[in-house]
């Protein structure tokens, strides 16, 4: 019995069928970040909760040392939200003598690392200037898209300023991926 | 014949195969909210259109009384966007005597209610300070992630201020979920 | 042997089983937009990279002339992020004599075109007032949801101002869809 017996007639070749419930999946949630050494010229990576509360990894999708490890090749939907919070940035001061200030910014990058490839690949980036009038500001950046990944690829989330990440609640800052 | 005959060799146990077309799915769209009684100390829940225009529910995923009802256990991708609009918030006034105002904010929460569990669980939260200079402001908050849900779980979308939700168009404010 | 042999007992009717790997999928990435004639009263459509870098189309999902062409009927998850950047809009000037200026705005629309239907359908809209204090601003708008599409439907991404789209990096501005 071959998988393609179930295919619509206009498709000739089929990968083997497989149950959805066994596909690699993970949803990771925020934890408080401890100060660590960051690589020079690279945004620091967040580390994550992978088993408590809403967090889980399943079907050979493993989390280790800030990375989600891709256990089999295929197309994955990858997503993350990071909520940032901070004090008024200096650019929210009214422009002095007609000279506008350079805006502060917040950035989230979902990065793929392939051991056989020297440079990490930036898959997704959300970047936003922050120029708030008022005292404290807070806001999320959400990202999500589909990518073709290879077994052994590693995924991480990098942020422009780790000290601005809201780590207080698992529903505010998270990271996930699942095989389609 | 067992589902695992189609499994890659490194996997031993498989859930039964099932067709994708029969999986529980819903996409709900905004309708105008009329003034109602809210539960104390809880953000009000939005109610939704579930069958007109772009909205639908299928394969035993039902919508009733502000809730999406989960018909079978499994991993679901859940998403919502809420577009807010309002008048200039007082915090956008220039800071008086060096004393910054507390910012207004807008918040969306996707909440899970399990009858056997006394407290609702907040699955996803998007929260943003609003400090706009200008008259009218408008902006969306988008959320989406994967969660393991149980048959009988109920999902709702709560917002910090129901009267700021943009109800004019079905493409601006919506809520959906589908079994992976 | 019928697909429904694998169904949970509470489901009677099943669509034929099919392998996940053969489903129509696409992830398109930003390219620099060349000036073109836009339709009156319609936001201009973006064109996309469909095969270089992170971009791909597969399993009969084709990209042509700003459109993703849907090759088979079913429920699709559709997503896009557009990163905008610009100079301070005039509404960020401090309100003169108590008269607030009308805010500038940025808008992304994911639109469906069905040849048999005269009017395009707006599936998703993200719209945001832009009133930044400071010089240059930049920010993303992300959209994603599930829709029932028909074979032959075409999808495009429209934006309010094509000249504000950040076309510099494939991870900042993108568009994708996949059959569930």
């Amino acid at each position: 019995l071959k998988g393609q017996e179930f295919a619509p007639s206009h498709q000739q070749v089929y990968a083997p069928l497989r149950a959805d419930g066994d596909k690699p999946r993970a949803h990771l949630t925020v934890v408080r970040q401890t100060p660590t050494q960051h690589f020079k010229n690279q945004f620091p990576a967040l580390h994550w909760e992978h088993e408590l509360g809403l967090a889980f990894t399943k079907n050979r999708m493993n989390y280790t040392n800030k990375f989600l490890l891709i256990p089999e090749s295929g197309d994955y939907f990858i997503y993350s939200q990071v909520t940032f919070r901070g004090m008024t940035s200096e650019c929210s001061e009214i422009r002095q003598a007609g000279r506008p200030n350079k805006p502060d910014s917040i950035t989230v990058v979902i990065t793929k690392v392939t051991d056989s490839y020297p440079e990490p690949t930036q898959l997704l980036m959300g970047t936003k200037s922050v120029c708030e009038v008022g005292s404290n500001w807070f806001q999320p950046i959400y990202l999500g898209a589909m990518f073709s990944l290879q077994e052994g690829d590693k995924l991480m989330v990098n942020v422009s300023d780790i000290s601005l990440v809201d780590y207080t609640k698992e529903d505010k800052t998270f990271f996930g991926a699942f095989l389609l | 014949l067992k589902g695992q005959e189609f499994a890659p060799s490194h996997q031993q146990v498989y859930a039964p195969l099932r067709a994708d077309g029969d999986k529980p799915r819903a996409h709900l769209t905004v309708v105008r909210q009329t003034p109602t009684q809210h539960f104390k100390n809880q953000f009000p829940a939005l109610h939704w259109e579930h069958e007109l225009g772009l909205a639908f529910t299928k394969n035993r995923m039902n919508y009733t009384n502000k809730f999406l009802l989960i018909p079978e256990s499994g991993d679901y991708f859940i998403y919502s966007q809420v577009t807010f609009r309002g008048m200039t918030s007082e915090c956008s006034e220039i800071r008086q005597a060096g004393r910054p105002n507390k910012p207004d904010s807008i918040t969306v929460v996707i909440t899970k209610v399990t009858d056997s569990y006394p407290e609702p669980t907040q699955l996803l939260m998007g929260t943003k300070s609003v400090c706009e200079v200008g008259s009218n402001w408008f902006q969306p908050i988008y959320l989406g992630a994967m969660f393991s849900l149980q048959e009988g779980d109920k999902l709702m979308v709560n917002v910090s201020d129901i009267s700021l939700v943009d109800y004019t168009k079905e493409d601006k404010t919506f809520f959906g979920a589908f079994l992976l | 042997l019928k697909g429904q042999e694998f169904a949970p007992s509470h489901q009677q009717v099943y669509a034929p089983l099919r392998a996940d790997g053969d489903k129509p999928r696409a992830h398109l990435t930003v390219v620099r937009q060349t000036p073109t004639q836009h339709f009156k009263n319609q936001f201009p459509a973006l064109h996309w990279e469909h095969e270089l870098g992170l971009a791909f189309t597969k399993n009969r999902m084709n990209y042509t002339n700003k459109f993703l062409l849907i090759p088979e009927s079913g429920d699709y998850f559709i997503y896009s992020q557009v990163t905008f950047r610009g100079m301070t809009s005039e509404c960020s000037e401090i309100r003169q004599a108590g008269r607030p200026n009308k805010p500038d705005s940025i808008t992304v629309v994911i639109t469906k075109v069905t040849d048999s239907y005269p009017e395009p359908t707006q599936l998703l809209m993200g719209t945001k007032s832009v009133c930044e204090v400071g010089s240059n601003w930049f920010q993303p708008i992300y959209l994603g949801a599930m829709f029932s599409l028909q074979e032959g439907d075409k999808l495009m991404v429209n934006v309010s101002d094509i000249s504000l789209v950040d076309y510099t990096k494939e991870d900042k501005t993108f568009f994708g869809a996949f059959l569930l």
Partner: antibody
Framework: EVQLVESGAEVKNPGASVKVSCKAS????????LHWVRQAPGQGLEWMGW????????NYAQKFQGRVTMTRDTSISTAYMELSRLRSDDTAVYYC???????????WGQGTMVTVSS | DIVMTQSPSSLSASVGDRVTITCRAS??????LNWYQQQPGKAPKFLIY???RLQSGVPSRFSGSGSGTDFTLTINSLQPEDFATYFC?????????FGPGTKVEIK
């Protein structure tokens, strides 16, 4: 049932002030903006402003700025609109109204007739 | 302020007629346009929001259309209880403003 009940008719002299009340029931008073709209005899509708009952924040039409004050007492789910320095052209029916969104008026009070006459 | 105009200011019609009222805004208000009906001596009643979406409980003979600056309220098959004054209102920006009204009278 959502209801707004306004205070009774008033007759005032020019230069005086009037304070109209609006008691809300059937919904969460602090959850929705409450507006005041007036209608002069035989004329159209004129929006005066809103109050946000949870915070007490207000937004007044420029025309009434400096003459109108909108307040609320959340303990009794009641909003108030005070208009000072009354003139004869302030003679009108004053309505309170509440909307499911801040920009429209779903439910209206029965109206309070205010007559300004010497 | 955004100025709303309505036409006609009044019209005469019979039961069963199809009636159309237009409303124009002095600048684009997107779809933030509401319609109200007012019977003599009564408070206004909310009919249509978002230019075209019927408020719950409003009969389906009422419909709205338009976006930007030009809007229309249509009553298909006028009923005796529909003889009233109709107001449009923009919810796009403060101050919220109303049209001057259109009086629908019995012919």
């Amino acid at each position: 049932e959502v209801q707004l009940v306004e205070s009774g008719a008033e007759v005032k002299n020019p230069g005086a002030s009037v304070k109209v009340s609006c008691k809300a029931s059937g919904y969460t008073f602090t959850g929705y903006y409450l507006h005041w709209v007036r209608q002069a005899p035989g004329q159209g509708l004129e929006w005066m402003g809103w109050i946000k009952p949870n915070s007490g924040g207000t937004n007044y039409a420029q025309k009434f700025q400096g003459r109108v004050t909108m307040t609320r007492d959340t303990s009794i789910s009641t909003a108030y609109m005070e208009l000072s320095r009354l003139r004869s052209d302030d003679t009108a029916v004053y309505y309170c109204a509440v909307g499911g969104s801040y920009d429209a008026f779903d439910i209206w009070g029965q109206g309070t007739m205010v007559t300004v006459s010497s | 302020d955004i100025v709303m105009t309505q036409s006609p200011s009044s019209l005469s019609a019979s039961v069963g007629d199809r009636v159309t009222i237009t409303c124009r805004a002095s600048q684009s208000i997107s779809s933030y346009l509401n319609w109200y009906q007012q019977q003599p001596g009564k408070a206004p009643k909310f009919l249509i929001y978002g230019a075209s979406r019927l408020q719950s409980g409003v009969p389906s003979r009422f419909s709205g259309s338009g976006s930007g600056t030009d809007f229309t309220l249509t009553i298909n098959s006028l009923q005796p209880e529909d003889f009233a004054t109709y107001f449009c209102q923009q919810g796009y920006s403060s101050p919220f403003t109303f049209g001057p009204g259109t009086k629908v009278e019995i012919k």
